[in-house]
Interface confidence: medium
């Protein structure tokens, strides 16, 4: 159905985006966009004088706040005001609707049902995503911020969808993929967060994603120069071949009895206790 602007809305200077509305183009004002905006600030012939400007400040008028409902336009009369009602409304304040479901008043696929009382000739039952007496207003469902943890919201129409930030998942981005809570690492392993997925830092002798796999510490052949590796409850032990020494048999033993250990730090002689 074509949009019905507020009755009397100036076709030259006004426009509407919703039923019963009258929005003014630049340079025009008033409820019907018929009053040109003046550069002068002293237009009003009525009301008390302002001490600061000397201009007449408008007092409250009968049309202030627009007492006319349903898009009616107000005009002042010598005694009070008068409402010019849009098609389908009547009454002192345009509060009575003469529109029926036959007029197709519900927008955006709204379902029209005849009103139960005389003051309401019809009621629009709006589809999801729309509201207003004529289902004319789109509900910004994403403004309710349904996506958690910084997710971006998309209103498809039939449903809301959330585009999650890295490290989060689920319909509302409610699942923290980095979260170690409730994710047990077996055999004394500790959970480490980061990188978009939790991981386990395993105790010696264990490996795998959850530290459930028994690891052979000797599998990587850690003992140098032909040393033999023995798995131990606390890790591994290297039995060095003749002529080598060190935790991994990495240091050769010289014939004169000295070893090729790393040089002592400056200020220390070999054999000195390290304070």
């Amino acid at each position: 159905a074509p949009l019905v602007c507020r009755a009397g809305c100036s076709p030259e200077h006004g426009f509407c985006e919703q039923p019963g509305e009258c929005r003014c183009l630049e340079g025009w004002t008033g409820p019907l966009c018929t009053v040109p905006v003046s550069t002068s600030s002293c237009l009003s012939p009525r009301g008390p004088s302002s001490a600061t400007t000397g201009c007449l400040v408008p007092g409250p008028g009968p049309c202030d706040g627009n007492p006319c409902a349903n898009g009616g336009s107000c005009s002042e009369t010598p005694r009070s005001f008068e409402c010019t009602c849009p098609r389908g409304f009547y009454g002192l304040r345009c509060e009575v609707s003469g529109v029926t479901c036959a007029d197709g008043p519900c927008f955006n696929g709204g379902l029209c049902v005849g009103g139960a009382d005389p003051d309401s000739a019809y009621i629009c039952h709006c589809p999801p995503g729309f509201q207003g007496s004529n289902c004319e207003k789109r509900v910004d469902r994403c403004s309710l911020q349904p996506c958690r943890n910084g997710g971006l919201c998309l209103d498809l129409g039939h449903a809301l969808r959330c585009r999650c930030r890295a490290g989060f998942a689920g319909p509302r981005c409610e699942h923290d993929l980095d979260d170690c809570a409730g994710r047990a690492c077996a055999n004394g392993g500790t959970c480490v967060e980061g990188g978009g997925a939790h991981r386990c830092s395993c105790a010696l002798g264990f490996g795998g994603r959850d530290c459930r796999e028994r690891a052979d510490p000797c599998a990587a052949r850690p003992c140098a120069h032909g040393g033999r590796c023995y798995a131990h409850f606390s890790g591994l032990v290297c039995a060095c071949a003749p002529g080598y020494m060190g935790a991994r048999c990495e240091f050769p033993v010289h014939p004169d009895g000295a070893s090729a250990l790393p040089a002592a730090p400056p200020g220390l002689r070999p054999g000195d206790p390290q304070r």
């Epitope: 589809p127 498809l156 129409g157 039939h158 449903a159 969808r161 585009r163 890295a166 319909p171 699942h175």
Partner: antibody
Framework: QSVEESGGRLVTPGTPLTLTCTVS????????MSWVRQAPGKGLEWIGI?????DPYYASWAKGRFTISKTSTTMDLKITSPTTEDTATYFC????????????????????WGPGTLVTVSS | ALVMTQTPSSVSAAVGGTVTINCQAS??????LAWYQQKPGQRPKLLIY???NLESGVPSRFKGSGSGTEYTLTISDLECDDAAIYYC??????????????FGGGTEVVVK
């Protein structure tokens, strides 16, 4: 509830072409709609969607090459500057799905589909 | 980018037999997977949504399963009418900005 495409024809490269998807039995303001194409003898290729509110989203390869828009009863796909690689059958389809998830899962799918309209780009 | 890899590209089985089509997503799509059937010259038809939910009117011979990144479509008691190309599609609105709803490459089912 049905959808149907129209506007497919033979065009020369560079000549803009607009395809139209007409729906009946449901409101375009309540459903997202999608365009999918299929080159002769090839698979299905997703082009983009337009949400119930009128916001279009495109596949990265389709940005700038296609424009999706809609009215109250039709959805359009404009091929801005067709090339021979755009020769295909173009389908429109409605997106259906659950409003809210019961657990950690929800679903979306395309149904119904139109019969398709053939676009041939040749000099 | 989210990529859907379908295997095999073609499979053949006798009437009454069973075929299995696999679909692998390059990231977790949380069971948001749809399967479609397309016969030559026709529009695609929705078979399964949410990885395992059968669309109304589709025979129970079609069964979808899987989770995470691995999904399967199984067609049992094959009929001649099942000869078609089958496509999987991710329906998960993901962090991928390249393609929101990508399809797999398709699997041709030949019924002997």
């Amino acid at each position: 509830q049905s959808v149907e495409e129209s506007g497919g024809r033979l065009v020369t490269p560079g000549t803009p072409l607009t395809l139209t998807c007409t729906v009946s039995g449901f409101s375009l303001s309540r459903y997202a709609m999608s365009w999918v194409r299929q080159a002769p003898g090839k698979g299905l290729e997703w082009i983009g969607i337009i949400t119930g509110g009128g916001d279009p989203y495109y596949a990265s390869w389709a940005k700038g090459r296609f424009t999706i828009s809609k009215t109250s009863t039709t959805m359009d796909l404009k091929i801005t500057s067709p090339t021979t690689e755009d020769t295909a059958t173009y389908f429109c389809a409605r997106m259906i799905g659950s409003e809210y998830a019961s657990s950690s899962e929800y679903y979306d799918a395309f149904d119904p589909w139109g019969p398709g309209t053939l676009v041939t780009v040749s000099s | 980018a989210l990529v859907m890899t379908q295997t095999p590209s073609s499979v053949s089985a006798a009437v009454g037999g069973t075929v299995t089509i696999n679909c692998q997503a390059s990231q977790n799509i949380y069971s948001n997977l749809a399967w479609y059937q397309q016969k030559p010259g026709q529009r695609p038809k929705l078979l399964i949504y949410g990885a395992s939910n059968l669309e109304s009117g589709v025979p129970s011979r079609f069964k979808g399963s899987g989770s995470g990144t691995e999904y399967t479509l199984t067609i049992s008691d094959l009929e001649c009418d099942d000869a078609a190309i089958y496509y999987c599609q991710s329906a998960y609105y993901t962090t991928s900005v390249d393609v929101l709803y990508p399809f797999g490459g398709g699997t041709e089912v030949v019924v002997k």
